[in-house]
């Protein structure tokens, strides 16, 4: 696995613990917590970042409304379980055998259940809304420069190929960015559009992933570009599957679906 | 450290130019925008404008568009700031400041030049 | 263009004493920014983001408000802290800095 040779470390995760110990002295990267070895050209998964953060100390509307099925991660932090390819295993359990399935970035989909519950498939998302709001800033963005800044962005930052961000739209001061990537589409290599995501999130809470790089500097046109609130909407190929109570009631959501549950990152 | 070093004192005559530099070190160049500040005798703190060097964007103070220019030059960490047709009242010290920004926070003009007095007289 | 009116004009401390400095804006501003200056020497940065401390300034300067209407609190003067202070917007172009306030010492 690549890393950086002179001086042995991951530059793609810092949650890694690198030493020359792989083939003829290279430099070898294994993420906390799991301690499997990651490629460090390229991102990790989110799987194995879960992993290691729990190991670690502790008008015309352009906007998109979110699909009834979308899923927003409400259940917080939690230690995954992770198969030996660093994705999420899709049955997910807590010490205290409460257990439940997850999709393929590792939300919730089904209601919990105990140990008999089944969870026969990991189902992939394959359309992730991030949904931005950015802070009042002295000059305005212009829709097209935002637009190609943020695409440059995901291909250069987090090596997600250009034709998985799908769309961006921006009604001031809200900003969406659209990610598409079904499972034929999902080539040998290609970053997954959960852990650019994921990649992402962390950066815009100035919890950079990245190895010894400074918080993200997103500027339009030199124009600084602070968030203020991230939301992340996550769409399964397969709808998730959960009880009528959770649907009609009772949920602790912030709109019409109560499965749109509000996340907060800022 | 981060430090911005300025070029030395200038006189000059009534409509004429003068050029200021400002030499950067200690951080990654491109990744701030340089700002310029003047302050005139016994006035208070003047904003002119901004450049960012990874890209060449500027902003400049409507009040002096037409009169500055700024310029960078990568290869050698340097921004300069241009101002044309001065007259007496330009007499001021002319600061550069950096402005470190990130999605999470703008944190202001820092650290800034040491300042370069530029006298207007005929 | 956003004016910034810092009052008072002069303030006149011992050591030890509390500042209070002012900062009111023409129109409501998201944030403020803080500087120090003293005789023959640049400004410094003290605050940014109406509240958050710049790297190495001491824990007794302290910022707050919202709107229009902002503050800076020296909570007990040092001698090293008598010098001139500015605010600055950054919610409009063009930037614009209060007209300073001086603290000086009684």
């Known amino acids: 696995h690549t890393a950086a040779q002179d001086n042995c470390t991951c530059p793609t995760n810092k949650m890694t613990v690198c030493s020359p110990d792989g083939p003829g002295g290279r430099c070898q990267c294994r993420a906390l917590g799991s301690g499997v070895a990651v490629d460090c050209s390229t991102l990790t998964s989110k799987c194995l970042l879960l992993k290691a953060r729990m190991s670690a100390p502790k008008n015309a509307r352009t906007l998109v409304r979110p699909n009834e099925h979308a899923l927003v991660d409400n259940d917080g932090l939690y230690d995954p379980d992770c198969d030996p390819e660093g994705r999420f295993k899709a049955r997910q359990c807590n010490q205290t055998s409460v257990c439940w399935c997850v999709n393929s970035v590792g939300v919730r989909r089904t209601d919990k259940g105990d140990l008999s519950l089944r969870c026969d498939e990991l189902v992939r998302t394959h359309h992730i809304l991030i949904d931005l709001r950015h802070r009042p800033t002295a000059g305005a963005f212009n829709h097209s420069d935002l637009d190609a800044e943020l695409r440059r962005l995901f291909r250069e930052r987090y090596r997600l190929h250009p034709k998985f961000v799908a769309a961006v739209h921006y009604e001031q001061p809200t900003i969406q960015i659209e990610l598409r990537q079904n499972t034929s589409q999902k080539a040998a290599g290609d970053v997954d559009i959960g852990d650019a995501a994921y990649y992402f999130e962390r950066d815009v809470k100035g919890e950079s992933l990245f190895q010894g790089r400074g918080g993200l500097d997103l500027r339009v046109r030199g124009e600084p570009l602070q968030v203020e609130r991230t939301l992340i909407y996550y769409l399964d190929e397969i709808p998730p599957k959960f009880s009528m109570k959770r649907l009609t009631g009772g949920g602790s959501g912030g709109g019409s679906h109560h499965h749109h549950h509000h996340h907060h990152h800022h | 450290q981060v430090q911005l070093v300025q070029s030395g004192a200038e006189v000059k005559k009534p409509g004429a130019s003068v050029k200021v530099s400002c030499k950067a070190s200690?951080?990654?160049?491109?990744?701030?925008?340089i700002n310029w500040v003047r302050q005139r005798p016994g006035q208070g703190l003047e904003w002119m404008g901004w450049i960012y060097p990874r890209d060449g964007s500027k902003k400049y103070n409507e009040k002096f568009k037409g009169r500055v220019t700024m310029t960078v030059d990568t290869s050698t960490s340097t921004v300069y700031m241009e101002l044309s047709s001065l007259r007496s009242e330009d007499t001021a010290v002319y600061y550069c400041?950096?402005?470190?920004?990130?999605?999470?926070?703008?944190?202001?003009?820092?650290?800034w030049g040491q300042g370069t007095l530029v006298t207007v007289s005929s | 263009e956003i004016v910034l009116t810092q009052s008072p004009a002069t303030l006149s401390l011992s050591p030890g004493e509390r500042a209070t400095l002012s900062c009111s804006a023409s129109s409501s501003v998201n944030y403020i920014y803080w500087y120090q200056r003293k005789p023959g020497q640049a400004p410094r940065l003290l605050i940014y983001d109406t509240s958050n401390l710049a790297s190495g300034i001491p824990a007794r300067f302290s910022g707050s408000g919202s709107g229009t209407d902002y503050t800076l609190t020296i909570s007990s003067l040092e001698p090293e802290d008598f010098a001139v202070y500015y605010c600055?917007?950054?919610?409009?172009?063009?930037?614009?800095f209060g007209q300073g306030t001086k603290v000086e010492i009684k």
């Open positions: 600055q917007q950054w919610n409009s172009y063009p930037l614009t």
């Open positions: 200690g951080y990654t160049f491109t990744s701030s925008d």
């Open positions: 400041a950096r402005r470190f920004a990130t999605v999470v926070s703008n944190y202001g003009l820092d650290p």
